[in-house]
């Protein structure tokens, strides 16, 4: 999916009002310096591409993020403010087998959510030059 035509300001507002709080809740008890940010993005569409990938695609050691509250809210925000996103996801869902995932918090998941927080921060500051 091409995130170029999303309403970025509305997605930012949803992040600031609710998604960010859910990410903080997930990370509670973890020091902010515990993980290094290794994933970056260059502009808002790129940031959303990376956010979608890290949030919904299972990775080695962390298969369960999609069930978390921040992930569900991310999904809905993209569906509401990215034209055509719902249709592409509905079609993709119909083509694949339903997968039930258990919620398991591992250190790898905490690291992944830390990366997500960095991507969201970058998404919210699009005019900053890439380091």
């Amino acid at each position: 999916y091409d995130f170029t035509n999303c309403d970025f300001e509305k997605i930012k507002a949803a992040y600031l009002s609710t998604i960010s709080k859910d990410l903080i809740t997930y990370m509670s008890g973890t020091k902010s310096t515990e993980f290094n940010n290794t994933v970056s993005c260059s502009n808002r569409p790129h940031c959303l591409t990376e956010i979608q990938s890290l949030t919904f695609n299972p990775t080695a050691g962390c298969a369960s993020l999609a069930k978390e509250m921040f992930a569900m809210k991310t999904k809905a925000a993209l569906a509401i403010w990215c034209p055509g996103y719902s249709e592409t996801q509905i079609n993709a869902t119909q083509a694949m087998k339903k997968r039930r995932k258990r919620k398991v918090t591992t250190n790898k998941c905490l690291e992944q959510v830390s990366q997500l927080q960095g991507l969201w921060r970058r998404f919210n500051r699009p005019l900053l030059k890439q380091q």
């Epitope: 569900m72 999904k75 996801q89 509905i90």
Partner: nanobody, 118 residues
Framework: EVQLVESGGGLVQPGGSLRLSCAAS????????MGWFRQAPGKERELVSA???????LYADSVKGRFTISADNSKNTAYLQMNSLKPEDTAVYYC????????????WGQGTLVTVSS
């Protein structure tokens, strides 16, 4: 077996109100999104409102301030209160539920037609 059953659609005049209901059965998961989608003739299905198991809500700009989504967990039912209806709100409205995040809205109702016309 999971079932979502919508009710409350119909014909209403511009400026009028309707309340859609979506009764869910066979669902036991604690984390969820309950969403109301709509599809107008010749257009893509769009998510107009969503409510989450923590009570928070999101609305599309086209309905914000006019539509209110709510849920009664004890009845496993979601509602969409639609006020100040406009002809452009005419569509088939679907409720959908996403319980465990693995896919995009796993469970769908059959849809209920809302027609706004004088």
């Amino acid at each position: 077996e999971v079932q979502l059953v919508e009710s409350g659609g119909g014909l209403v005049q511009p400026g009028g109100s309707l309340r859609l209901s979506c009764a869910a059965s066979g669902l036991t998961f604690s984390s969820y999104i309950m969403g109301w989608f709509r599809q107008a003739p010749g257009k893509e299905r769009e998510l107009v409102s969503a409510i989450f198991s923590d009570g928070s809500t999101l609305y599309a700009d086209s309905v914000k301030g006019r539509f209110t989504i709510s849920a009664d967990n004890s009845k496993n039912t979601a509602y969409l209160q639609m006020n100040s209806l406009k002809p452009e709100d005419t569509a088939v409205y679907y409720c959908a539920r996403d319980d465990y995040g693995g896919n995009f809205f796993d469970y769908w109702g059959q849809g209920t037609l809302v027609t706004v016309s004088s």
